[in-house]
Interface confidence: medium
C-alpha cells in the first residue's frame, strides 16, 4: 500500500491496533522490513507499507483526520471529499474525522444528502455499520451532539465555534463519498440547530446534546421540523430529567410559523402538543444550575408524523374555470392573541400543499380540503375585476354581481367579495341596480342584515366612500361617475341562508360628470335616512352628488336635515345645495358655507337634492344627514 498526503493538506492518517481480539496469530504493519503496530502519516509524507497477515481488518483500524482551520483564512466550504480516496486505503475499518475550528461568531452547517440521518441512543448500532458521530464545542469543552445512522430524517445540523464530524465505515463498505457538505452561516446564537425533514408519514427519535449525560448548563438547542402540511405531527417525551436550577427555568418552546401565539412555552413534564399541521420548531432551554447539586438535564423525545386522525377528508371543488380576473383567498380571521397553544389550521390544495393562507385564481378548477379543528378560524376574501377597455364595446352591457355558488358551498365563512369595476376615463359611467332596494347604513337606522354592500371609489388618488348599503330600503339605483369597488361584506353566518337576497347588476352607461346619483323611491310610512358620501371624513373637495327622490301621486314627502348648519368652511369656491322640483323645475339654492340648512319641507312631487362641495379648510368638512318620510296626502293638490 502507498499513502501519499499532499503538503499542507492538514491530513493525518493513523493506522493502529483495533479492539484486541483473541486471535492467536499477531499481525504487524511492515515498513522497510520493520514490524510495527502503529503508523502515523502526516501532511507531505509518502509511505509504502504492507501487513504481515492476510486479514489486517481483524487487527487494525485506520483514522484519517483532516483539520480545517477557519480562524486564520478562508474556509473550504462545499461538498466534503473522502481524502485519500477509499480505493487507495487498505481495507480496514476506517474513520474519517473532520475537525473544523471557527470563530464564535461563525455558524457552520453540515448538510446531509439523501439518505438523511437517524439519531441512535446509547447501546444502539447501525444496521450497515456506517455511523456519523457529531460533536461541537463550547469554549474548550467538547459537546456530543449525537450519533447517527443512515436512512432517517436529519438533513442539516448547524453549529458555531467548531464542529467535529467522524464518519465510521466498516472495512467491507463500498462507500466512497462523505455524503455531506459544509456551509457557512451567520451565528446561530445557540449550541446547535438540527433540521429534520419528513417526506411522508414516519417518526424520529431525537436526543439532547450529550445524552444520556447532562445537557450543558444554560444552553439552548433547537430542532426544526419540516413536515408536509397535509400531515400532522405529535411530540412525545420518552425520557427526561430535570437539573436543579438556581436561576431561570428549564423549558421547551415551540415555534409554529403562522401561529399568533409564538413561542408556545411548555414545561418538560407538561403534555406536549399534538396534531400540529406543517412545519414547527422545538427548542430546549437549560438553566443556571445549583453549583453544589447540579443534577442533569436530558431529553429523549419522539416526533410522530401521520395523516390527520378523526378529521373529514372531504374535498371541495372550487370551479373558477369560467371566471376571470378573480382571486379567492382563504386565510385566518384576525383573533385576539392568546398564550394558549392552538393547533394549526390549514387549507390544502389538491390535499398536498397546505398553508394557513391559500389564494386561488381564476381560469382553473381547484380541489381544496381543510386541516383545521375549527373552520370558524378561517374566512374567505374574494376579488374580481370587471373592466371595460373600450366604451364602444360595452356601453349598455350589464353584469350580474353575484357570489358564485361554488364559493357559497365552501365550509368557510365569506368575509368580503369585492368587485372592482373599471371603465374608460371620461367615456363611461356605471349604474348599480339591486335586486332588492337598498338601505343606507346610518347611526340612526343601522343595517341589521347579514350582509352589506360597501361602495367606494377605485381610483387610487380619490378617497371617496359612498357608503354601506343593505337590502330592505328605498334606494333603487346608484349611479357613479367612474371606477368603483363594490364589496359584499358578510356580518353573520346566516348569510348562507340570506344569500338569495344578494343580487346587484352593474351596467356601463354613458359618462356623466357628477360623482354619484342615488335614485330613491321611499316606501309609505318608513323614514329613509340618507347621508353624504365619506361620512366622518367629509365630502371630497369640489365633489357633487345628487339624490333623485320619487314621490308617489297620493303621497307627500317631508325632507328633514339633522342639523342647523352644514359646518363646512370653504377655503376656495362655494358649497351649495339645490333642491329642485322635477315637475315644475322650481329650485331653491342654499349656500352651505353661509346659510342655515332649510327647515323641514314638504314636497308633493318628485324632487332632486344636489349637494356640491367647495375646497374646505381642514377640520371643517361637509357632512350632511337628512331623511325623507312619506305620508298620505290629505288634500289632492293636482
Amino acid at each position: 500500500f502507498e499513502i501519499a498526503l499532499p503538503r499542507e493538506s492538514n491530513i493525518t492518517v493513523l493506522i493502529k491496533l483495533g479492539t484486541p481480539t483473541l486471535l492467536a496469530k499477531p499481525c504487524y504493519i511492515v515498513i522497510s522490513k520493520r514490524h510495527i503496530t502503529m503508523l502515523s502519516i502526516k501532511s507531505g509524507e509518502r509511505i509504502v507499507f504492507t501487513f504481515s497477515c492476510q486479514s489486517p481488518e481483524n487487527h487494525f483500524v485506520i483514522e484519517i483526520q483532516k483539520n480545517i482551520d477557519c480562524m486564520s483564512g478562508p474556509c473550504p466550504f462545499g461538498e466534503v471529499q473522502l481524502q485519500p480516496s477509499t480505493s487507495l486505503l487498505p481495507t480496514l475499518n476506517r474513520t474519517f474525522i473532520w475537525d473544523v475550528k471557527a470563530h464564535k461568531s461563525i455558524g457552520l452547517e453540515l448538510q446531509f444528502s439523501i439518505p438523511r440521518l437517524r439519531q441512535i441512543g446509547p447501546g444502539e448500532s447501525c444496521p450497515d455499520g456506517v455511523t456519523h458521530s457529531i460533536s461541537g464545542r463550547i469554549d474548550a469543552t467538547v459537546v456530543r451532539i449525537g450519533t447517527f445512522c443512515s436512512n432517517g430524517t436529519v438533513s442539516r445540523i448547524k453549529m458555531q465555534e467548531g464542529v467535529k464530524m467522524a464518519l465510521h465505515l466498516p472495512w467491507f463498505h463500498p462507500r466512497n463519498v462523505s455524503g455531506f457538505s459544509i456551509a457557512n452561516r451567520s451565528s446561530i446564537k445557540r449550541l446547535c440547530i438540527i433540521e429534520s425533514v419528513f417526506e411522508g408519514e414516519g417518526s424520529a427519535t431525537l436526543m439532547s446534546a450529550n445524552y444520556p449525560e447532562g445537557f450543558p448548563e444554560d444552553e439552548l438547542m433547537t430542532w426544526q421540523f419540516v413536515v408536509p402540511a397535509h400531515l400532522r405531527a405529535s411530540v412525545s417525551f420518552l425520557n427526561f430529567n430535570l437539573s436543579n436550577c438556581e436561576r431561570k427555568e428549564e423549558r421547551v418552546e415551540y415555534y409554529i410559523p403562522g401561529s399568533t401565539t409564538n413561542p408556545e412555552v411548555f414545561k418538560l413534564e407538561d403534555k406536549q402538543p399534538g396534531n400540529m399541521a406543517g412545519n414547527f420548531n422545538l427548542s430546549l432551554q437549560g438553566c443556571d444550575q445549583d453549583a453544589q447539586s447540579p443534577g442533569i438535564l436530558r431529553l429523549q423525545f419522539q416526533v410522530l408524523v401521520q395523516h390527520p386522525q378523526n378529521e373529514s377528508n372531504k374535498i371541495y371543488v372550487v370551479d373558477l374555470s369560467n371566471e376571470r380576473a378573480m382571486s379567492l383567498t382563504i386565510e385566518p380571521r384576525p383573533v385576539k392573541q392568546s398564550r394558549k397553544f392552538v393547533p394549526g389550521c390549514f387549507v390544502c390544495l389538491e390535499s398536498r400543499t397546505c398553508s394557513s393562507n391559500l389564494t386561488l385564481t381564476s381560469g382553473s378548477k381547484h380541489k381544496i380540503s381543510f386541516l383545521c379543528d375549527d373552520l370558524t378560524r378561517l374566512w374567505m376574501n374574494v376579488e374580481k375585476t370587471i373592466s371595460c377597455t373600450d366604451h364602444r364595446y360595452c356601453q349598455r352591457k350589464s353584469y350580474s354581481l353575484q357570489v358564485p355558488s361554488d364559493i357559497l358551498h365552501l365550509p368557510v365563512e365569506l368575509h368580503d367579495f369585492s368587485w372592482k369595476l373599471l371603465v374608460p376615463k371620461d367615456r363611461l359611467s356605471l349604474v348599480l341596480v339591486p335586486a332588492q332596494k337598498l338601505q343606507q347604513h346610518t347611526h340612526e337606522k343601522p343595517c341589521n342584515t347579514s350582509f352589506s354592500y360597501l361602495v367606494a371609489s377605485a381610483i387610487p388618488s380619490q378617497d371617496l366612500y359612498f357608503g354601506s348599503f343593505c337590502p330592505g330600503g328605498s334606494i333603487k339605483q346608484i349611479q357613479v361617475k367612474q371606477n368603483i369597488s363594490v364589496t359584499l361584506r358578510t356580518f353573520a353566518p346566516s348569510f348562507q341562508q340570506e344569500a338569495s337576497r344578494q343580487g346587484l347588476t352593474v351596467s356601463f352607461i354613458p359618462y356623466f360628470k357628477e360623482e354619484g346619483v342615488f335614485t330613491v323611491t321611499p316606501d309609505t310610512k318608513s323614514k329613509v335616512y340618507l347621508r353624504t358620501p365619506n361620512w366622518d371624513r367629509g365630502l371630497p373637495s369640489l365633489t357633487s352628488v345628487s339624490w333623485n327622490i320619487s314621490v308617489p301621486r297620493d303621497q307627500v314627502a317631508c325632507l328633514t336635515f339633522f342639523k342647523e348648519r352644514s359646518g363646512v368652511v370653504c377655503q376656495t369656491g362655494r358649497a351649495f345645495m339645490i333642491i329642485q322640483e322635477q315637475r315644475t323645475r322650481a329650485e331653491e339654492i342654499f349656500s352651505l358655507d353661509e346659510d342655515v340648512l332649510p327647515k323641514p319641507s314638504f314636497h308633493h312631487h318628485s324632487f332632486w337634492v344636489n349637494i356640491s362641495n367647495c375646497s374646505p379648510t381642514s377640520g371643517k368638512q361637509l357632512d350632511l344627514l337628512f331623511s325623507v318620510t312619506l305620508t298620505p296626502r290629505t288634500v289632492d293638490l293636482t
Epitope: R324, A325, G363, S387, T389, D390, Y393, C394, K397
Partner: antibody, heavy 119, light 107 residues
Amino acid sequence: QVQLVQSGSELKKPGASVKVSCKASGYTLTDFSMHWVRQAPGQGLEWMGWINTETGAPTYADDFKGRFVLSLDTSVSTAYLQISSLKAEDTAVYYCSRGRDYDPHFDYWGQGTLVTVSS
Amino acid sequence: EIVLTQSPATLSLSPGERATLSCRASQSISDFLHWYQQKPGQAPRLLIKYASQSISGIPARFSGSGPGSDFTLTISSVEPEDFAVYYCQSAHSFPYTFGQGTKLEIK
C-alpha cells in the same frame, strides 16, 4: 351544437360587389357579438370589425371603413359582410367568428368563404 | 393600436419536444390576449384565453403565461397533430389585432 355556416366561394371581377353570409345555429344569435376576420392567401389574420347583434350597430377597423358593410338579419340568425368596388387585393378567405365577453375571444368560427377578385 | 410581434417566425421541432412560442405586445395589455391554432385549409381554433386560461376540449399539453406585455404559449410535448400556425390576438382595445403567426413545423 354551436355552428357558424358561411356561404360558398365567390369569383368576382374588379369593381363588382359580393355579399358573404354567416348563419348561426345552436345558440341565440343576439347573445354574442359577431366578428369578421380576413386572411389573404399565405398571410396572417386581420380583424375587420364586429356587429353588435343586440342593436345591429357595426364597428369597423380603420382599414375596413368605406367599402365594407356588416349587417344582420336576426329573423334568420344570419350575419352578412358586403364588399363593394372589389379590388384584386380583396382576394382572401373571410371568416365570421363568435365573440365572447366584453374583450372578446373567438370561440367558434365559420369555415371561411374564399372571395377571388380577378379580371 | 396594439402591435403584436410573434417569435420565432418558424419553429422546427420533432414530436415529443417542448415548444415555446412568444408573443410580445407593444404595450402592457394585462391578460387580454388569446391564442389560436390554424391548420392549412381550416379556420383558426381557440387554444388559450386570457393569457393562461385553458379551453375545454384542448389538450392539457397547451399552456399559456402572462399577463403584461410578454406572453408565451407552451406545448409541453409536441404531438404530430400540433404542427400548424399559431396566432396570438389582443382583445385589449380596438382594433383587435393578431400577431403575424408562428409556424410550427416538423424537423
